[in-house]
Interface confidence: low
């Protein structure tokens, strides 16, 4: 494991006094109920805290909310409950914070059963002032801001009406009834599924997918027989019932539903599901569930059209019951993803891909670590990291793996070293190179966060006992120092730092408990005096990402290019600063066959990089549809991997083939698409079985 508190560590001098001068306590005058915290805007220092205390009575729930505001990153809070007329706020809707730096906030109030509609409180000045607005409907979901214009809001009502506001919630208009799911698309487009029979729960698979580009003046039905739909990057996905009525197939559009292609993916039955694990404007990671209650499926990666898919990973863990998957995009290094597979012996094992799903390998264990009891060979094993599935299973894992785009190469995760994920108490492991190598950084489970673009890592031990100590590292987790932030330990509930990992402030949340009362308390620690000076050129060093063999000319080439970064030296204790920008130098690589995926009708035999034609497409029940009718597809068998920037080198040219295959999808063809003006039949029904998982783009 990493060196602890010994001489090898570059210790920060006099840190206790420096941190003590920058530790701010705030005790909230509240009975302990629930607390939620939201940052308003970027680099504004504004935090809103909503505390809620519920008293469940037989007939109704009586509650009390308090709203607090800080404008100095949590060092001081002011009670602003009077700005919302001391109203009880519905915690299940949370605080709807506007995109970017709009300064907009919407709070949804609890109203009495007999009221005509709901009530919201709106602020457009970073919660300095609020306006009370009574709604003409009862909201079913949190208000959804248009990504392009935060004045435009979308909401579903409990009666399944779709409501739009164009003036930040001041005035609302119902634009459609019997709506099951609605989402903002690009350029102010709204997509939604509707059932004109009125039920959302019973008729999955009989929904219409509709689109409006003028906020409800007119509508276009872009697809029928819809089970569900999702948006990811430039892609619009719809799972559509096939002719047999029991199977569903994925259809993809890159023009907002004007035209559709059928994805070259296996169809699924009613007990299975599709899930978009990740998507950008270039490609998609799609999980396809296996038949039965297996708890696993297969990951496919798409081409740039979203229609041709290559098998990426089999036996991918994704539970049917809870919908948990360990799939994680390691945002601190391009092309890196981790997830878990369910092995034949039912053990869960971690795998990592450094090339956007091209190949998956076990995680290399720390050099000096011993294999645990799960290992058959005590010398040969790998690191396994805990993610959503471990948390859902109730293991002692307080946090998901953590990485930040501006903390290049840095990854923190709970894990164990063996043949499979262990149910034993996990430790915290840190990688500084995007997951290629790891060190054991902390014994036992911890909460952790990244500050100052990786310049500081802060951790707090996960314990059922009250705590009063934090640990911090200024060298990417190699060495740790401890600071006692209060004499009176608190029951810890959460660690909060501004999203984006640019801040140098950390807030420790918890409660104190005496014989009769318990109160919320926060401690905000500013690390600015620990990192006394701004970093200079001499504090940075050149680092080649994905480097595994420095002798190889193509070393570091991933998806056709390599990148050199300026990284902060571990020995430098200085501030990257809030305006820090990652400095990187890309260089293009020569193409090899690994830069291409096999086009439709071709496949790669095992241990071969060449794409071979599927003999007469035998044994393949995959249907390939272009624009909902029979088409010719010309291909040379290879297609550049989405996002691959290679040039020169291998240029796989094959004789051009004509592939013709009848499309048997009963998907609605564009020429049959109909337009209509506003207004449709009434009806009601609940939003059922459609959800967005943690960082998962779309799950049916």
């Amino acid at each position: 494991s990493a060196p602890g508190e010994d001489e090898e560590c570059g210790r920060v001098r006099d840190f206790v006094a420096k941190l003590a001068n920058n530790t701010h306590q705030h005790v909230f005058d509240d009975l302990r109920g629930s607390v939620s915290l939201s940052w308003v805007g970027d680099s504004t220092g504004v935090i809103l805290v909503l505390t809620t205390f519920h008293v469940p009575l037989v007939i109704m729930t009586f509650g009390q909310s308090k709203l607090y505001r800080s404008e100095d990153y949590g060092k001081n809070f002011k009670d602003i409950t009077d700005l919302i007329n001391n109203t009880f706020i519905r915690t299940e809707f949370g605080m709807a914070i506007g995109p970017e730096n709009s300064g907009k906030v919407v709070l949804t109030a609890e109203v009495s059963g007999g009221s005509r509609g709901g009530r919201i409180f709106r602020s457009s000045d970073f919660a300095k002032n609020f306006v009370q607005t009574d709604l003409p409907f009862h909201p079913l979901t949190q208000m959804m801001y248009s990504p392009q214009n935060s004045d435009y809001l979308l909401a579903l009502s409990t009666e399944n009406g779709l409501w739009v506001s164009k003036n930040f919630g001041g005035k609302w208009e119902e634009i459609h009834k019997t709506v099951c799911l609605a989402k903002w698309g690009r350029k102010g487009t709204i997509f939604f599924t509707a059932n004109h029979n009125g039920s959302c729960s019973n008729d999955r698979g009989m929904l219409e997918l509709e689109r409006t580009t003028d906020y409800g003046k007119s509508f276009k039905t872009v697809a029928s027989k819809i089970y569900s739909f999702g948006l990811g990057g430039k892609f619009l996905f719809a799972s559509v019932m096939t002719g047999k009525g029991t199977l569903r197939a994925i259809h993809v559009s890159v023009d907002d539903g004007d035209t559709w292609n059928m994805a070259q993916l296996p169809p699924v039955g009613h007990e299975q599901f599709y899930s978009i694990l990740a998507a950008n404007d270039e490609m998609v990671f799609m999980h396809v569930d296996e038949p039965g209650d297996s708890g696993f499926g297969t990951i496919y990666v798409s081409d740039d059209r979203g229609t041709v898919y290559s098998k990426s990973l089999e036996r991918h863990l994704y539970t049917t019951t809870g919908g948990e998957t360990d799939f994680i995009n390691v945002t601190s290094l391009r092309g890196v993803f981790t997830t878990s597979i369910l092995a034949e012996d039912k053990s869960v094992q971690s795998v990592i891909s450094f090339d956007q799903g091209g190949e998956w390998v076990p995680l290399r264990k720390p050099a000096d670590s011993k294999c645990d009891a799960t290992a058959r060979d005590p010398e040969k094993c790998s690191l396994h990291i805990h993610a959503a599935y471990s948390i859902a299973t109730g293991l002692n894992v307080p946090m998901l793996p953590l990485s930040e785009p501006n903390a290049v190469g840095l990854v923190l995760a709970h894990g164990s070293v063996g043949d499979a994920i262990s149910v034993m108490r996990p430790d915290v492991y840190v990688s500084d190179d995007g997951g290629y190598t790891w060190i054991k950084a902390l014994e036992g489970p911890h909460y952790y966060t990244i500050l100052d673009s990786g310049g500081i890592i802060v951790a707090i031990e996960h314990s059922s006992r009250p705590i009063n100590v934090i640990k911090f590292s200024t060298d990417e987790g190699q060495c740790w120092q401890t600071y006692t932030f209060t004499r009176d330990p608190i029951y810890f509930t959460g660690l909060a730092s501004e999203p984006g990992a640019r801040s140098m402030n950390i807030s420790i949340w918890g409660f104190t408990e005496s014989f009769l009362t318990s109160q919320w308390v926060s401690y905000t620690i500013d690390f600015k005096d620990i990192l006394e000076r701004n970093c200079e050129e001499k504090d940075y060093t050149i680092w080649l990402a994905h480097s595994t063999d420095p002798e190889d000319y193509e070393d570091g080439c991933i998806l056709g290019y390599k990148e050199q970064f300026l990284r902060l030296r571990k020995s430098s204790v200085c501030q990257n600063g809030r305006d820090y920008v990652v400095t990187k130098q890309p260089s293009i690589c020569l193409c090899s066959l690994e830069d291409f995926l096999c086009d439709f009708g071709y496949y790669r035999p095992e241990n071969d990089s060449k794409c071979v034609e599927q003999p007469e497409l035998k044994g393949h029940d995959l249907e390939f549809c272009l624009y909902g009718r029979e088409e010719h597809l010309t291909t040379n068998g290879y297609r550049k991997i989405p996002g691959d920037k290679c040039q020169g080198g291998v240029n796989p040219v094959r004789e051009v083939k004509d592939l013709k295959k009848k499309c048997t999808s009963n998907f609605l063809s564009p020429e049959k698409q109909n337009s209509k003006s506003n207004g449709s039949a009434g009806g009601s029904g609940g939003l059922n079985d459609i959800f967005e998982a943690q960082k998962i783009e779309w799950h049916e």
């Epitope: 209650d293 869960v348 499979a420």
Partner: antibody, heavy 121, light 109 residues
Framework: EVQLLESGGGLVQPGGSLRLSCAAS????????MNWVRQAPGKGLEWVSA????????YYADSVKGRFTISRDNSKNTLYLQMSSLRAEDTAVYYC??????????????WGQGTTVTVSS | EIVLTQSPGTLSLSPGERATLSCRAS???????LAWYQQKPGQAPRLLIY???SRATGIPDRFSGSGSGTDFTLTISRLEPEDFAVYYC??????????FGQGTKLEIK
């Protein structure tokens, strides 16, 4: 409080049938795999059958395969064991148990009080 | 099929003493999939240990589990009167899904 309550046991002749029920309460039934485990008089524990949370997958010990059928009704929070072609060696106390995670085995953490099945002429 | 053999068949000890119960597998078992149960006369079994060494909820810390591969041990550091019972080890595998050991009877000397 998490509870499992078996019922349906009794005396039955060889070759006969019996249906055991297990009523679950205090937890989200559909999220858990469930098992039947039996214990013959004066003997040890023997696993009989298991069923996944959704009911989509079922598993049986070789000694009961083809004769016993495990099922569940998640809307009623109830687990069933349909036993047919019963033999004298099926005589035992039958326990309903909770617990199997994919990839983790957290043990059978909840057991019912058991129901007695006697197969005799 | 993996066979679990527990030893000794019967263990006679006095309250306050230390008890060591053994469970040996016919082939290697992942420690993540080994559990121990306690059963008192006329009662249903109770889960003590899962994952070879993790104590189940509410189990006193005098109970501990250890081992890997084919050899596993349940240790009761200081016997209390209520600890005298039959103890079973169990593994979770593929076919059959679960197998139990034949049990060790812990009786008062």
């Amino acid at each position: 409080e998490v509870q499992l309550l078996e019922s349906g046991g009794g005396l039955v002749q060889p070759g006969g049938s019996l249906r055991l029920s297990c009523a679950a309460s205090g937890f989200t039934f559909s999220s858990y795999a469930m098992n039947w485990v039996r214990q013959a008089p004066g003997k040890g524990l023997e696993w009989v059958s298991a069923i996944s949370g959704s009911g989509g997958s079922t598993y049986y010990a070789d000694s009961v395969k083809g004769r016993f059928t495990i099922s569940r009704d998640n809307s009623k929070n109830t687990l069933y064991l349909q036993m047919s072609s019963l033999r004298a060696e099926d005589t035992a106390v039958y326990y309903c148990t909770r617990g199997r995670g994919i990839g983790y085995y957290n043990g059978m953490d909840v057991w019912g009080q058991g129901t007695t099945v006697t197969v005799s002429s | 099929e993996i066979v679990l053999t527990q030893s000794p068949g019967t263990l006679s000890l006095s309250p306050g003493e230390r008890a060591t119960l053994s469970c040996r597998a016919s082939q290697s078992v992942s420690s993540s999939y080994l559990a121990w149960y306690q059963q008192k006369p006329g009662q249903a079994p109770r889960l003590l240990i899962y994952g070879a060494s993790s104590r189940a909820t509410g189990i006193p810390d005098r109970f501990s589990g250890s081992g890997s591969g084919t050899d596993f041990t349940l240790t009761i550091s200081r016997l209390e009167p209520e600890d005298f019972a039959v103890y079973y080890c169990q593994q979770y595998g593929s076919s059959p899904m679960y197998t139990f050991g034949q049990g060790t009877k812990l009786e008062i000397k």
